[in-house]
């Protein structure tokens, strides 16, 4: 690897730095589908990017393997929690790969934020954060589910959402 | 762009690069000000420091346009609540921007700590992180807000802090 | 600082750019001791790895110096809460440094969790995400202790983590 | 400026049960917890329990728990204490008192309410 | 519960005079390096007063001659020159944990 090389390898590096892959997804009406299927995210407007990142279907979809550190946000809340419901709420950040048929738990949170809000009147908020640095391949996509989805409040794209950056 | 253009952007980079971006400020006796402004924050002792970022009555200003990972935590705590289990604590990071007269809300939680209190112990511990990535110019500013701050708790700078970092 | 030394350092840069110090550890059926150490973490299997930094211990162990976003999240839970336990749960991430006899607490969280469970047979779950920007010299270490750790709750290293990245 | 008004006294039988009203005046009414404490004859002052106006949560002393109630009537700013079964040992001045800003302590008071029960 | 205990039941002081309360608590009132104590005043025939709000606290409008400190289980309320406005009876009051619960009090009254 010569000078020319190095040298070609350096301007190359310094054009992929001033791209070094980030997202941030935000929260939406159409987040929440009731499909079963992960959630869905705004990708351009507010304060929503995609940078040297794509997105399908609720997921961001890696263009340049590497380390990325990917984070979610979401924001839990209720009047009384719906009967029936098991008291825990299970938010997680999940890998699709083309090298294997289902999903892949990444980064989980495990909540029991109904616990107090015992009357069918009481109102009560939680949140539910998550982050952590994974490696991710070209082509590899990551997505955010939460069950019970009910009880993902949305409103502005600020409360719920979700990001990652490469490290 | 000839080879010495690039040569002066590669040093240029490279001095930038050792100075990328960084903050992280933190919780003091002096934070809480009961005025309905934003939280202030220690940004020289202890664990606390501001490179390539400065400060301004609790706002991070930022001098090189960019992507950053901002982040917050506040600890919350009290002996029961002042509105009772009803009590809402509302976390923010918000950008004051010259070109706009209004703080823009760019992440923001809602919890109900107080039901953490047991029905003969009123003491209670909650805390609340954000973090996400956002673009912000120079000369933008990002301030840390809590509603109601009578229950964010100070100590020692290790459980409230407010940081960013370019990404 | 000629020409030559410029590119040296150049490439020095861009190889030492290329292993941005990265780790993610994970929790394991082995973290929970409980001697009153740190927890202790798996450091390949899995989503675990280590890059630039290494492990002893329980501690990630800085190997290049600079400012790091390092990270953990437990998972807690539980059936009702331990007979005599205080209500609160303490999460944090220590410093070891040679220079110092003792621990140095960096980011610290509380949290009620068994509020959440009202009453003794209740199974309640609850999450504790910390992260921010510390600056670490080589050989300085990092550890996550959790008082009291008899409530995390670890299964398959996506719950309980401990990670940095220099930023 | 903050007023806390209270009802009349009350002369009632062993038995009987009294209800006490407390009528807030002068500050956000739906702000502030509204605790309750008596003041027995030759006693000290004694905690009855709390009442959160903005929702209508109680928190009630154990001593009292099954023969007191507390309401509220957000739209005229007023607390009530009911008190049943009543019996001599009852016999108090009964205070409704503000919860502070910082709500652990009771900066104002009501100027009490005298309830004899004698048969 | 946790039982508050004053001392002396009786204090007689002269106007002019420095008088010291006591109070103590069954277990530590303290959250978070802050006292849940507060002293109140009352004399006959009228609601009682706050004076002093998580052990060290002045409420507002009340005189700088009274003063609050202690922590943990033992607190002490002092009137550094009594008035005659201050003969009354005196109550330390802890707010950690429910049932909040008084002192028996202190009686304040003209040597």
């Known amino acids: 690897d010569g000078p020319a090389g190095s040298w070609e390898q350096l301007i190359q590096e310094r054009r992929s730095h001033e791209v070094n892959p980030a997202a941030h997804l935000t929260g939406a009406n159409s987040s929440l589908t009731g499909s079963g299927g992960p959630l869905l995210w705004e990708t351009q407007l507010g304060l929503a990017f995609l940078r040297g990142l794509s997105y399908h279907d609720g997921a961001l979809v890696v263009t340049k393997a590497g380390y990325y550190y990917i984070y979610s946000k979401v924001q839990l809340g209720g009047v009384g929690c719906p009967l029936g419901l098991a008291s825990t709420i299970t938010h997680g950040l999940y890998k699709r790969t083309p090298r294997y048929p289902e999903e892949l738990e990444l980064l989980v949170s495990q909540q029991s934020p109904c616990g107090r809000a015992t009357s069918s009147s009481r109102v009560w908020w939680d949140s539910s954060f998550l982050g952590g640095v994974v490696h991710l391949e070209a082509g590899e996509e990551v997505v955010v589910r939460v069950l019970d989805e009910r009880l993902v409040r949305l409103r502005d794209g600020t409360r719920s959402y979700f990001g990652a950056f490469m490290v | 762009d000839g080879p010495a253009g690039s040569w002066e952007q590669l040093i240029q980079e490279r001095r930038s690069h050792e100075v990328n971006p960084a903050a992280h400020l933190t919780g003091a006796n002096s934070s809480l000000t009961g005025s309905g402004g934003p939280l202030l924050w220690e940004t020289q002792l202890g664990l606390a420091f501001l490179r390539g970022l400065s400060y301004h009555d609790g706002a991070l200003v930022v001098t090189k346009a960019g992507y950053y990972y901002i982040y917050s935590k506040v600890q919350l705590g009290g002996v029961g609540c002042p509105l009772g289990l009803a009590s809402t604590i509302t976390h923010g990071l918000y950008k004051r921007t010259p070109r706009y007269p209004e703080e823009l809300e760019l992440l923001v939680s809602q919890q109900s700590p107080c039901g953490r209190a047991t029905s003969s112990s009123r003491v209670w511990w909650d805390s609340s992180f954000l973090g996400g990535v956002v673009h912000l110019e120079a000369g933008e500013e990002v301030v840390v807000r809590v509603l109601d701050e009578r229950l964010v708790r100070l100590r020692d700078g290790t459980r409230s802090y407010f940081g960013a970092f370019m990404v | 600082d000629g020409p030559a030394g410029s590119w040296e350092q150049l490439i020095q840069e861009r190889r030492s750019h290329e292993v941005n110090p990265a780790a993610h550890l994970t929790g394991a059926n082995s973290s929970l001791t409980g001697s009153g150490g740190p927890l202790l973490w798996e450091t390949q299997l899995g989503l675990a790895f280590l890059r630039g930094l290494s492990y002893h211990d329980g501690a990630l162990v800085v190997t290049k110096a600079g400012y790091y976003y390092i990270y953990s999240k437990v998972q807690l839970g539980g059936v009702g809460c331990p007979l005599g336990l205080a209500s609160t749960i303490t999460h944090g991430l220590y410093k070891r440094t040679p220079r110092y006899p003792e621990e140095l607490e960096l980011l610290v969280s509380q949290q009620s969790p068994c509020g959440r469970a009202t009453s003794s047979s209740r199974v309640w779950w609850d999450s504790s995400f910390l992260g921010g920007v510390v600056h670490l010299e080589a050989g300085e270490e990092v550890v996550v202790r959790v008082l009291d750790e008899r409530l995390v709750r670890l299964r398959d290293g996506t719950r309980s983590y401990f990670g940095a990245f220099m930023v | 400026q903050v007023q806390l008004v209270q009802s009349g006294a009350e002369v009632k039988k062993p038995g009987a049960s009294v209800k006490v009203s407390c009528k807030a005046s002068?500050?956000?009414?739906?702000?502030?917890?509204m605790n309750w404490v008596r003041k027995a004859p030759g006693q000290g002052l004694e905690w009855i329990g709390r009442?959160?106006?903005?929702?209508?949560?109680?928190n009630y002393n154990q001593k009292f728990m099954g023969r007191v109630t507390f309401t509220v009537d957000r739209s005229t700013s007023t607390v009530y204490m009911e008190l049943s079964s009543l019996r001599s040992e009852d016999t108090a001045v009964y205070y409704c008192?503000?919860?502070?800003?910082?709500?652990?302590?009771?900066?104002?008071w009501g100027q009490g309410t005298l309830v004899t029960v004698s048969s | 519960e946790i039982v508050m205990t004053q001392s002396p039941a009786t204090l007689s002081v002269s106007p002019g005079e420095r008088a010291t309360l006591s109070c103590k608590a069954s277990q530590s009132v303290d959250f978070d390096g802050d006292s849940y104590m507060n002293w109140y005043q009352q004399k006959p025939g009228q609601a009682p007063r706050l004076l002093i709000y998580?052990?060290?606290n002045l409420e507002s409008g009340i005189p700088a001659r009274f003063s609050g400190s202690g922590s943990g289980t033992e607190f002490t309320l002092t009137i550094s020159s009594l008035q005659s406005e201050d003969f009354a009876v005196y109550y330390c009051q802890q707010s950690i944990e429910d049932p909040w619960t008084f002192g028996q009090g202190t009686k304040v009254e003209i040597k």
């Open positions: 002068g500050y956000t009414f739906i702000d502030h917890i």
């Open positions: 009442i959160y106006p903005v929702s209508g949560e109680t």
């Open positions: 008192g503000r919860g502070s800003y910082y709500w652990n302590a009771m900066d104002y």
């Open positions: 998580s052990a060290s």
